[in-house]
């Protein structure tokens, strides 16, 4: 399967008619939040305009991180590259000139939680870093005959696993935590990300611990040490901002699956154990969309499935599989790639809202150690209102 390429819309959508909380919490327009996972990022593939000889990038930045990647682009082998990152709270702009590296480092620290305008310019073997329109830092290296062969994507907020290690100090290759806005190349806005991993709108207002799944869609793929076999117990708390959406999905190559989702406020568990589909559901007396936290537990004991929603419970007994097979399979939380949905599993909306205290078989699951966070998912913080 391929991670779904998710784009973030620019306007807040209206309040969900069934939900106490708006499905788009208050956020800064055109600003996106990065961090929470090591490789939180947006990727921009097809850029208008060439930046071979001369380029001027500009961006707005707000962070409290001391270290982390803000911008990175390179050729395939990462011999030619350009990067902006944080080191000890200072901004570092770097690119190569032939085999040498030109590095410009700010004297001031900019991890003060305030917005800063940053312009980074490359003109062949010269570089300029302009911060807040006031401080201009400039460096040059002797020119070379080598041509600069940069190839997309531009990585914003972080890089793909394994990238940038060759050129950037280890504690700055991981995603920075904070917000970016208004990325421009040579005065033209760069808006449509081809892929998004753990990036949400830049929310305003109080935040609390949890993993937030934004309306734009996304999902978490759990680390492979977690898998759902013949017997398991999954428990988690949800505070939805929409009355429908995928909560948990596990799928094996031979078509067996577990799917937990909400549909119009009802929680449904569907299972296929290699014989046929079977399902159970709970319609809570208290709406899950009331702005409070609700606890959901799914227990599978071979062909018996139990669903608990708060204090309400239901069961289904499926057919016995005479030769049950225990698979290791990826577990998706908050959404599922469409390529994995079988005809029997109608395409389901991704979940919108917050999930916390996710536990499998008594072991707390850290989403920050997930195998993949795709789309508009904020790992460690949820808008509280």
């Amino acid at each position: 399967w391929d991670p779904v390429a998710l784009k973030l819309p620019e306007r807040n959508t209206p309040r969900n008619s069934h939900c106490h909380l708006s499905n788009s919490p208050r956020a800064i327009e055109h600003a996106y939040q990065y961090g929470g996972t090591a490789n939180s990022r947006q990727e921009f593939e097809h850029l208008k305009g060439d930046f071979g000889a001369k380029s001027q990038f500009s961006i707005r930045l707000r962070t409290r991180s001391s270290h982390g990647m803000i911008f990175y682009v390179s050729d395939q082998e990462e011999n030619d590259f350009m990067t902006l990152f944080l080191a000890h709270g200072r901004l570092v702009y770097m690119f190569n000139v032939g085999h040498k590296k030109l590095k410009i480092r700010s004297q001031e620290k900019y991890n003060d939680g305030l917005w800063h305008d940053v312009i980074f310019i490359r003109e062949r073997s010269s570089g300029r870093l302009v911060i807040d329109g006031l401080r201009v830092l400039e460096e040059s290296l002797p020119p070379t005959e080598a041509t600069w062969k940069i190839k997309g994507p531009i990585y914003l907020g972080g890089v793909a696993p394994g990238k940038a290690v060759k050129n950037v100090q280890i504690n700055s290759i991981y995603s920075f935590s904070g917000c970016l806005s208004n990325l421009q190349l040579n005065g033209a806005s760069i808006t449509s990300a081809s892929q998004t991993f753990s990036v949400t709108p830049c929310f305003e207002g109080p935040m609390e611990t949890g993993t937030y799944f934004s309306t734009e869609g996304g999902y978490v793929v759990l680390d492979e040490s977690f898998n759902i076999g013949l017997k398991f117990e999954i428990a988690f708390e949800v505070r939805p901002r929409s009355s429908s959406g995928t909560l948990v999905h596990g799928h094996s190559v031979n078509g067996e699956y577990l799917n937990v989702h909400m549909k119009n406020g009802q929680v449904i568990v569907k299972v296929n154990n290699g014989i046929r589909d079977f399902s159970t559901s709970v319609t809570p007396k208290q709406s899950l969309c009331d702005g409070r936290w609700h606890r959901i537990t799914v227990i599978r004991d071979s062909n018996v499935v139990q669903l608990d929603v708060d204090s309400e419970v239901n069961h289904v007994v499926g057919p016995l599989n005479p030769k049950p097979i225990d698979h290791r399979e990826p577990v998706f939380v908050g959404g599922v790639p469409e390529s994995l949905l079988t005809p029997r599993l109608a395409p389901s909306k991704p979940f919108t809202g917050c999930i916390r205290h996710f536990v499998i078989d008594g072991h707390p699951v850290s989403f920050s150690k997930a195998a993949l966070v795709s789309g508009a998912v904020s790992i460690n913080s949820c808008p509280a209102a």
Partner: antibody, heavy 119, light 113 residues
């Protein structure tokens, strides 16, 4: 404390049916699965099936599907197992057993009802 | 159905002796998700229902003396009594707790010399 009360013995004729009872006390009856187990003298136990009093969900051992019918009466916190078309092969001790919860073991057993099928 | 095979069918021992009995299942009882083996050992004395000694193959039920130890994984399991006492004379059953239908072994009867 948890108690599962079962009649000590039942004597029935071949071909007849019998309804064995198991009255639960000392815990919330509707919260836990109740299982039934058969044990013939000198043999290992055999699992018949399980029922959840709240949802009414039942999971049978295929071997006993046409023999046993599990039901509950929530108002009296009693589980029942009806055995039909009795033969001498059905003569055994029948236990009702409470399960701690799904994925866990049996935590309480009744004392068992000795069923004798004889003319 | 998973078939549980116990051996030996009976054991004659003297007090203080170490005893081991075996239980084999026709399919693995190891759950890959939580890496637990769903095998339970019971002790049954005459006229009484079975009593849980060990669950998850090696976890001792509270109140069970530590001379009882469960071990093994997958399809091969062992119950060991480090020093048999007179009150340990009983029939010991292993049970597949992994998949339905739940199945029991035929038992190992522990007798005193």
């Amino acid at each position: 404390q948890v108690q599962l009360q079962q009649p000590g013995a039942e004597l029935v004729k071949p071909g007849a049916s019998v309804k064995l009872s198991c009255k639960a006390s000392g815990y919330t009856f509707t919260t836990y699965w109740m299982h039934w187990v058969k044990q013939r003298p000198g043999q290992g136990p055999e699992w018949i099936g399980m029922i959840h009093p709240y949802s009414g969900a039942i999971n049978y051992n295929e071997k006993f599907k046409s023999k046993a019918t599990l039901t509950v009466d929530k108002s009296s916190s009693t589980a029942y197992m009806q055995l039909s078309s009795l033969t001498s092969e059905d003569s055994a001790v029948y236990y009702c057993v409470k399960q701690l919860r799904l994925l866990y073991y049996f935590d309480y057993w009744g004392q068992g009802t000795t069923l004798t099928v004889s003319s | 159905d998973i078939v549980m095979t116990q051996s030996p069918s009976s054991l004659t021992v003297t007090a203080g002796e170490k005893v081991t009995m075996s239980c084999k299942s026709s399919q693995s009882l190891l759950n890959s998700g939580n890496q637990k083996n769903y095998l339970t050992w019971y002790q049954q004395k005459p006229g009484q229902p079975p009593k849980v000694l060990i669950y998850w193959a090696s976890t001792r039920e509270s109140g069970v003396p530590d001379r009882f130890t469960g071990s093994g994984s997958g399809t091969d399991f062992t119950l060991t009594i480090s020093s048999v006492q007179a009150e340990d004379l009983a029939v010991y059953y292993c049970q597949n707790d992994y998949s339905y239908p739940l199945t029991f072994g035929a038992g190992t009867k522990l007798e005193l010399k």
